[in-house]
Amino acid sequence: EEELQVIQPDKSVLVAAGETATLRCTATSLIPVGPIQWFRGAGPGRELIYNQKEGHFPRVTTVSDLTKRNNMDFSIRIGNITPADAGTYYCVKFRKGSPDDVEFKSGAGTELSVRAKPSAPVVSGPAARATPQHTVSFTCESHGFSPRDITLKWFKNGNELSDFQTNVDPVGESVSYSIHSTAKVVLTREDVHSQVICEVAHVTLQGDPLRGTANLSETIRVPPTLEVTQQPVRAENQVNVTCQVRKFYPQRLQLTWLENGNVSRTETASTVTENKDGTYNWMSWLLVNVSAHRDDVKLTCQVEHDGQPAVSKSHDLKVSAHPKEQGSNTAAENTGSNERNIY
């Protein structure tokens, strides 16, 4: 009679993470008597995956009933496959012995490869806001994929970026991999509505890449431009001065009026108007009673935007051009902000 052979017909098996792997094995004879064992890897460090004789294997099921006397099918199924299960599996026949069974013959091995999807890319930007014309860095991370081959692209508003560096770790063999990429983006004043997108393509995604996004509204700070103008005289002894604060982002803004260097009024931007590009405009006005001033008045509009150092714009109010009203001792009238916006 021909000597028993252990046949593993599949040289390799490819399984998606979470699915069940079937590892096929048959013996050509019932003799010698003894159990079958499955191992991952070879040599002294091999891992026992299934033992027909003893042990408890909650992830493994046999394809056929191994208790039947004439059974020669020793195929197994391993459920809930993860990348950690990748490796070469050997079906090994043992000969009954005393006190221990003796290894008799091994199959050629089946390499189990596991395909695992990458996690959703996470994009993160700089910790502090930056202003237009500055270059900022964005990072993108995705984990847990296998095999190692992966493609990562960066986009800004649909336009592909070229200034980025990408690493896939670890460099050597591993059960799963991670990707880390850093892209450099130059900010413009129009970027409040812009998005940076990291796109990851992998064989497991079947042509439908994963995307992670970051809104540049979280990153950009557009400083305001200021213009102080004197409006036509409302009454004989009153002058209306406006400070137009234009094209700023984010909204957090505090404005202070100074008359000859002395604080006249402070207010916080509340009712703003939004421009098409996502920036804001706001206007504050001050009613100055010129009859209270003997000399020219220097009016300053001072703006502190988003916690940054204050910027200011001044306007010289010529008092001599206006008749003085006797008996008035009010320097300025607290009027609050005007809800009209002047462009």
């Epitope: 003893e54 042990g55 408890h56 909650p58 992830r59 809930n80």
Partner: antibody
Framework: QVQLQESGPGLVKPSETLSLTCTFS??????????MGWIRQPPGKGLEWIAH???????YYNSALQSRVTISKDTSKTQVSLKLSSVTAADTAVYYC?????FGSGQAWFTYWGQGTLVTVSS | EIVLTQSPGTLSLSPGERATLSCSSS???????LHWYQQKPGQAPRLLIY???NLASGIPDRFSGSGSGTDFTLTISRLEPEDFAVYYC?????????FGQGTKLEIK
């Protein structure tokens, strides 16, 4: 830390069905290689394994009790249940909820035990 | 099913003495599948030794285990007052998992 708490009726009538619940905390039964089971101990006697269920829903039963026993898990509620039908006085015992861990290479053992609940079968 | 037989049924010793508890299996089992538990009165059992000779977490090293095939031993080198309890061996070699009937270690 890991905690297991059995609950159920202290007294069951013969021929009725015994229902026990084990509420656990400190771990998840969604985790690979973790299972939950039941072991009982009649007063003054030894330990008898009844059944256990793994994270992947595979169930194992003691063949001496299998026709009367059902084990189930509710992962969302972090609970495991045991039902034992057609009870007799021989089913009177302290019932322990246990966590069983799989350590690879066919090795599994009972790592954590509840304090046990005494169930008496009597009319 | 695999039947585990523990001996002696009761062991009477004094603190400081050495205790040797035996567990015999009706079938040959690999040493990796034989475990020991300790149970004190009114308490649940707790894992003492796994895989014949490995101490579970928090178990003092006066406990040790040995054996192979069908014969396994639990040894306590110097008995402490808190060691007096019932000890059970358990096999995880085959379903159904089974326990020995227990050895009661009592103070002499």
């Amino acid at each position: 830390q890991v905690q297991l708490q059995e609950s159920g009726p202290g007294l069951v009538k013969p021929s009725e069905t015994l229902s026990l619940t084990c509420t656990f905390s400190g771990f998840s039964l969604n985790t690979y290689d973790i299972g939950m089971g039941w072991i009982r101990q009649p007063p003054g006697k030894g330990l008898e394994w009844i059944a256990h269920i793994w994270w992947n829903d595979r169930e194992y039963y003691n063949s001496a009790l299998q026709s009367r026993v059902t084990i189930s898990k509710d992962t969302s509620k972090t609970q495991v249940s045991l039902k034992l039908s057609s009870v007799t006085a021989a089913d009177t015992a302290v019932y322990y909820c246990v966590r069983i861990d799989y350590f690879g290479s066919g090795q599994a053992w009972f790592t954590y035990w509840g304090q046990g609940t005494l169930v008496t079968v009597s009319s | 099913e695999i039947v585990l037989t523990q001996s002696p049924g009761t062991l009477s010793l004094s603190p400081g003495e050495r205790a040797t508890l035996s567990c015999s299996s009706s079938s040959t089992i690999s040493s990796t599948y034989l475990h020991w538990y300790q149970q004190k009165p009114g308490q649940a059992p707790r894992l003492l030794i796994y895989g014949t000779s490995n101490l579970a977490s928090g178990i003092p090293d006066r406990f040790s285990g040995s054996g192979s095939g069908t014969d396994f031993t639990l040894t306590i080198s110097r008995l402490e007052p808190e060691d007096f309890a019932v000890y059970y061996c358990q096999q995880g070699s085959r379903i159904p998992f089974t326990f020995g009937q227990g050895t009661k270690l009592e103070i002499k």
